[in-house]
């Protein structure tokens, strides 16, 4: 790995609890100021694999509320608008990191956790399982 | 919002940093573990929208390593192999939440910054502008 | 090898029409979408339309749409642009370039091979 | 609609790195090729798939491309690279082909 030169003005840490417990500023920086945010919103709708999006909130976590998606049909949409079988709606799939508070209820104190998350939905050619 | 009771066995956290402050263990707790990690491992190659995986790595950032997709071909793959221009293959885009050295160089203190990324490609009908 | 040769540049009147053609050789042309792309006498290069390989799909710059056809014959391995309600600003060399995709959809190369360019003068 | 946007010229000694500039809202996230243009000739793929390069393009050539900019570097720059350079990606909003509006690259 890369190794960083230390910043003398960083906060002090004990090697025992290094680096398990860290410091983390909640004051989110956002890096995607020039981002269109409607861009990919009609996306779910006009994809040939289409999905719905579920809000799944959990108090305990942060952030609490995360969408997730569910790709509407077994098939694909064709170009007549009509469910074609011979592909497959599959959920696009993400690993992402999450704050979960612990202990529980706690508000200053918190986790890391990696959930999956379904983003979306992509249309795949299935894999053919042939009879011997 | 939900109120929830604040746990007795919290951590103290003067008010005057709360909620910009707090503390995170970093030993990451995984849900996933019932997860099939290669089950989606292929949908890049057999998507009607395929794409390719690019690695973003930045050691100011946890997790330092982040794989990002980009689409192949501005149409999808038809039933034949060739590139539909019918359609638009488009990245499905997530808002993720990463931990950034803040000050840098900092192995102990970090700021939450919400980055978009570029999880894959999904196929969908352009939208067609007329003129005039 | 492969190539494209553009033809039927020259000096039009703004309002006027003109047709210009690409002969492809050397690769299978129904495989792939083509373009054209021009360039003012200075200037940058500025795409102006997309074709797919079997010519369902097209594509125009605003600047030029619904003034610009876009067409292909397969069967004579034929790439064509029709210019009308032509005016100053269309005056460049236009060139047909070539996108290639491989059969499986593995790799995508737009303007991978280009034509030596054809000269529109739009002037009275 | 997406633009990208190029210094509009360059200068390097001979045997120099040259770094020509490529930039536009959240490029990483888009493909980026780069055309080599000679004055009176048309234009050459130099680079595809933001650091692909076509067999014939020497290895000199190179690209990258993260945040909101794309590179193409020429090490050991040579006086018969001097030429015009454009960057160029697609943009699925308007199924459009941009460029960017081209560096002049001159080899001292």
């Known amino acids: 790995g890369i190794t960083i030169p230390r910043n003398p003005g960083c906060p002090n840490s004990e090697d025992k609890n290094f680096p398990r417990t860290v410091m983390v500023n909640l004051n989110i920086h956002n890096r995607n100021t020039n981002t269109n945010p409607k861009r990919s919103s009609d996306y779910y709708n006009r994809s040939t694999s289409p999905w719905n999006l579920h809000r799944n909130e959990d108090p305990e976590r942060y952030p609490s509320v995360i969408w997730e998606a569910k790709c509407r049909h077994l098939g694909c949409i064709n170009a007549d608008g009509n469910v074609d079988y011979h592909m497959n709606s599959v959920p696009i799939q993400q690993e992402i990191l999450v704050l979960r508070r612990e202990p529980p209820h706690c508000p200053n104190s918190f986790r890391l956790e990696k959930i999956l998350v379904s983003v979306g939905c992509t249309c795949v050619t299935p894999i053919v399982h042939h009879v011997a | 919002g939900i109120t929830i009771p604040r746990n007795p066995g919290c951590p103290n956290s003067e008010d005057k940093n709360f909620p910009r402050t707090v503390m995170v263990n970093l030993n990451i707790h995984n849900r996933n573990t019932n997860t099939n990690p290669k089950r989606s491992s292929d949908y890049y190659n057999r998507s009607t929208s395929p794409w390719n995986l690019h690695r973003n790595e930045d050691p100011e950032r946890y997790p330092s390593v982040i794989w990002e997709a980009k689409c192949r071909h501005l149409g999808c793959i038809n039933a034949d192999g060739n590139v539909d221009y019918h359609m638009n293959s488009v990245p499905i885009q997530q808002e993720i939440l990463v931990l950034r050295r803040e000050p840098p160089h900092c192995p102990n203190s970090f700021r939450l910054e919400k980055i978009l990324v570029s999880v894959g490609c999904t196929c969908v009908t352009p939208i067609v502008h007329h003129v005039a | 090898q492969v190539q494209l040769v553009e033809s039927g540049g020259g000096v039009v009147q703004p309002g006027g029409s003109l047709r210009l053609s690409c002969a492809a050789s050397?690769?299978?042309?129904?495989?792939?979408?083509m373009h054209w792309v021009r360039q003012a006498p200075g200037k940058g290069l500025e795409w102006v339309s997309l074709?797919?390989?079997?010519?369902?799909?097209?594509y125009y710059a605003d600047s030029v749409k619904g003034r610009f056809i876009i067409s292909r014959d397969n069967s004579k391995n034929s790439l064509y642009l029709q210019m009308n309600s032509l005016r100053a600003e269309d005056t460049a060399v236009y060139y047909c370039?070539?996108?290639?995709?491989?059969?499986?959809?593995?790799?995508?190369?737009?303007?991978?091979?280009w034509g030596q360019g054809t000269l529109i003068t739009v002037s009275s | 609609s997406y633009e990208l946007t190029q210094a509009p010229s360059l200068s390097v000694s001979p045997g120099q790195t040259a770094n020509i500039i490529c930039s536009g809202d959240?490029?990483?996230?888009?493909?980026v090729s780069w055309y080599q243009q000679k004055p009176g000739q048309s234009p050459l793929l130099v680079i595809y798939?933001?650091?692909r390069r076509p067999s014939g393009i020497p290895a000199r050539f190179s690209g990258s491309n993260s945040g909101n900019t794309a590179t193409l570097t020429i090490s050991g720059t040579q006086t018969r690279d001097e030429s015009t350079y454009y960057c160029?990606?697609?943009?699925?909003?308007?199924?459009?082909?941009?460029f960017g509006g081209g560096t002049k690259l001159t080899v001292l």
């Open positions: 370039a070539r996108h290639f995709s491989d059969s499986r959809g593995r790799s995508d190369v737009p303007f991978d091979i």
């Open positions: 050397g690769f299978t042309f129904d495989d792939h979408a």
């Open positions: 074709i797919s390989g079997d010519g369902g799909a097209t």
């Open positions: 959240n490029l990483r996230t888009k493909y």
């Open positions: 798939q933001d650091t």
């Open positions: 160029m990606t697609w943009d699925v909003d308007t199924t459009s082909m941009i």
